[in-house]
């Protein structure tokens, strides 16, 4: 029969290095009789036999950690006791070795130029990983603005446009290397106007192009404001190249205005805005159409359809890039202005405007427009539209613009040919001939120096004294 023997640990525990998720085993070989009870502790806390993370075999002599976690790090001890003599103990350390792991990777960042950007990169690993950064395809060099912090994060002071790009952090130790996903650093730049629109002084009915160039990141949008409201007409062409937007507003000028270019871009929930303004003022509308070249053709437009003589040829002024279009838009704009005038004035003014903008034309080697006869112009001015005309002259002389008849392309009556001198040299307004049959009384107009008779106008008076000397802009 065997003699009782106190436990002796024949293979003391050693330090074990283990990788996360791998198996780690401690061996505690004991010689004794009778067979001892062996218990295991980790950091002096008993490991329970039924803990499924461990396997205890060979009568307790073999402790296996089935899948090592970084929290398993610590001092493991085995204690053997069989009641003979004292209990014996042996201890060894578990060092959990860990390939680098990025626990807080960097994320995409949008940052306004001049501010500070921090790209996080928190890592785990044993040995402790070193952290470096790559921008694009190259290792990022630290400098006075750019530093890798103790935590691994990348800090950039006073962010510049050239800092924009793709970044990734690299965590490295003796066991391996970990790379973060590529993240984008976007540097946002407040909208700024590089080229402001220029002011213009042009004739009525001219085309003007206002140009505004802006830069920013993201590329700004450009909007145009006319006298405080969104631009209602005109065409806008935009071109974007290298963060620069070039906007061109083409206008058909029928009234003066203040045009503002507004460049806007968005930074998160906030907007940045830059503004620049230009004025468009109107010079004298145009010289006599006899001085301008043109051609005779049928009127195909809509506005003056009911006013002009059917099938007649009208004069198109080739000082416009597209005469037919330009004159039609001009008359359309003019008619909109006439919405504000009296019912007596409006049809007469429409007849005057249509026959002035689309003058009857004699084709030939040199197509010649036929201006309106002075007497008909004066009839509109001093009979049908006397009140409106006086108001207009007062406003235009002060350089003001109001709705009604201001800045309309109306002729200067005193400069028109008289039908008394040459009835074939000027155009009659059929509307006024028709109205004389229906109108029996006209507003009484007195003139200090009666000078011109308006033939057959009106039916109730044999002659009507008017002054041809009114100036008209």
């Amino acid at each position: 029969e065997k003699l009782p023997k106190a436990p002796v640990i024949t293979t003391p525990l050693e330090t074990v290095d283990a990788l996360v998720e791998e198996v780690a085993t401690f061996m505690c070989a004991v010689e004794s009789y009778p067979q001892p009870e062996i218990s295991w502790t980790r950091n002096k806390i008993l490991i329970k036999l039924f803990d499924t993370r461990y396997s205890i075999r060979e009568n307790g002599q073999l402790l296996t950690i089935l899948s090592v976690e970084d929290s398993d790090d610590g001092i493991y001890c085995c204690t053997a006791n069989n009641g003979v003599g004292g209990a014996v103990e042996s201890c060894g350390a578990l060092q959990v070795k860990m390939k680098p792991k990025i626990t807080r990777p960097p994320i995409n960042v949008k940052i306004i130029e001049g501010l500070k950007a921090v790209l996080p990169c928190t890592t785990m690993g044993n040995p402790k990983p070193s952290v470096s950064w790559i921008k694009g395809d190259s290792a990022l060099r630290e400098n006075s603005r750019i530093a890798v912090l103790e935590s691994g994060s990348l800090r950039i002071h006073n962010v510049q446009k050239e800092d924009a790009g793709q970044y990734r952090c690299v965590a490295k130790n003796s066991l391996g290397t970990a790379y973060s996903k590529l993240v984008k650093l976007e540097v946002e730049v407040f909208a700024r106007i590089l080229r402001a629109p220029e002011s213009h002084n042009v004739t009525f009915g001219s085309f003007v192009t206002l140009r505004c160039t802006a830069i920013g990141m993201p590329v700004p949008t450009i909007s145009w404001i006319e006298n405080g409201n969104a631009v209602s007409s005109g065409s806008i062409q935009e071109n974007v190249k290298d963060r620069v937007i070039d906007s061109r507003l083409q206008l058909f000028i029928t009234k003066p205005g203040l045009y503002t270019c507004i460049a806007t871009n968005k930074h998160g929930e906030k907007f940045s805005t830059a503004k620049a303004a230009a004025t468009v003022s109107i010079a004298e509308w145009s010289k006599s159409q006899k001085e301008s070249k043109g051609y005779c053709a049928q009127y195909r437009g809509e506005v003056c359809d009911a006013v002009l003589v059917k099938d007649s040829l009208v004069f198109f002024n080739t000082s416009y890039p597209d005469p037919e279009e330009a004159q039609e838009l001009l008359i359309h704009t003019a008619w909109n202005e006439l919405k504000a005038v009296s019912p007596l004035c409006r049809p007469a003014a429409e007849a005057l405007l249509c026959n002035h903008l689309f003058q009857e034309c004699s084709p030939g080697v040199l197509p010649t427009p036929m201006p309106i006869c002075r007497e008909y112009c004066l009839a509109v001015k001093e009979l049908f539209c006397a009140k409106e005309w006086l108001a207009m002259e007062g406003k235009t002389h002060r350089g003001l613009y109001r709705s009604g008849m201001h800045f309309l392309p109306v002729p200067e009556c005193s400069k028109l040919p008289s039908m008394h001198q040459d009835p074939t040299a000027c155009t009659r307004l059929p509307y006024l001939d028709y109205k004389k049959e229906n109108i029996t009384t006209f507003p009484s107009i007195t003139s200090s120096k009666p000078s011109v008779d308006i033939p057959n106008l009106p039916a109730s008076t044999s002659s009507f004294a008017v002054s041809p000397a009114y100036s008209m802009t």
Partner: antibody, heavy 121, light 112 residues
Framework: EVQLLESGGGLVQPGGSLRLSCAAS????????MSWVRQAPGKGLEWVSA????????YYKESVKGRFTISRDNSKNTLYLQMNSLRAEDTAVYYC??????????????WGQGTLVTVSS | QTVVTQEPSFSVSPGGTVTLTCGLS?????????PDWYQQTPGQAPRTLIY???SRHSGVPDRFSGSILGNKAALTITGAQADDESDYYC????????????FGGGTKLTVL
Amino acid sequence: EVQLLESGGGLVQPGGSLRLSCAASGFTFSDYGMSWVRQAPGKGLEWVSAIPWSGGSTYYKESVKGRFTISRDNSKNTLYLQMNSLRAEDTAVYYCAKRSGRIAFGALDAWGQGTLVTVSS
Amino acid sequence: QTVVTQEPSFSVSPGGTVTLTCGLSSGSVTSSNYPDWYQQTPGQAPRTLIYSTDSRHSGVPDRFSGSILGNKAALTITGAQADDESDYYCGLYSYSGSKNYVFGGGTKLTVL
């Protein structure tokens, strides 16, 4: 790039109705006159109707007056042709066409691919 | 009723010059009819060549030119090429009681 896309064609019985639409893109629709032009199978082009930029006037070929209505919705960049009391002779490919300027009778400078209208019992 | 007349067919040799005309059954074609010319190949939508007598549409080669010859509108193709083989239509603005736009019957051009 100017694009005109017609839709709404199909087979309809004599006396029936159809509404053609033309969706416009690539230009400022409200600045241009528009037209409908048709082409019967194996035949030549035939102007049907025109409308200026503002939509304030409308013009029609004599044989469709009173039966067809052209209209436009500048806010939707869309041209329409409402065709009522259709006849066998209205069978054709209907083209939507853009005018070169604001007026209804400028040159036709851009065309859609057309939509076929068949009037048959 | 305005009737616009065109030659039904025409042929030209490659490299040759051809002039297609467009007339009115009653009266002369003038610049006031704003003659336009269109080209159409089978199965395709028409394409604008010339507008308002002699203005070339953008992208149209300068081999194509428009004019008024006598009492007709004319489309001249110089240095004809195989892919010029198409139907050619003229369109005229006309005012006879009401505004109208009238196409000719078209000319089938063959490049031999």
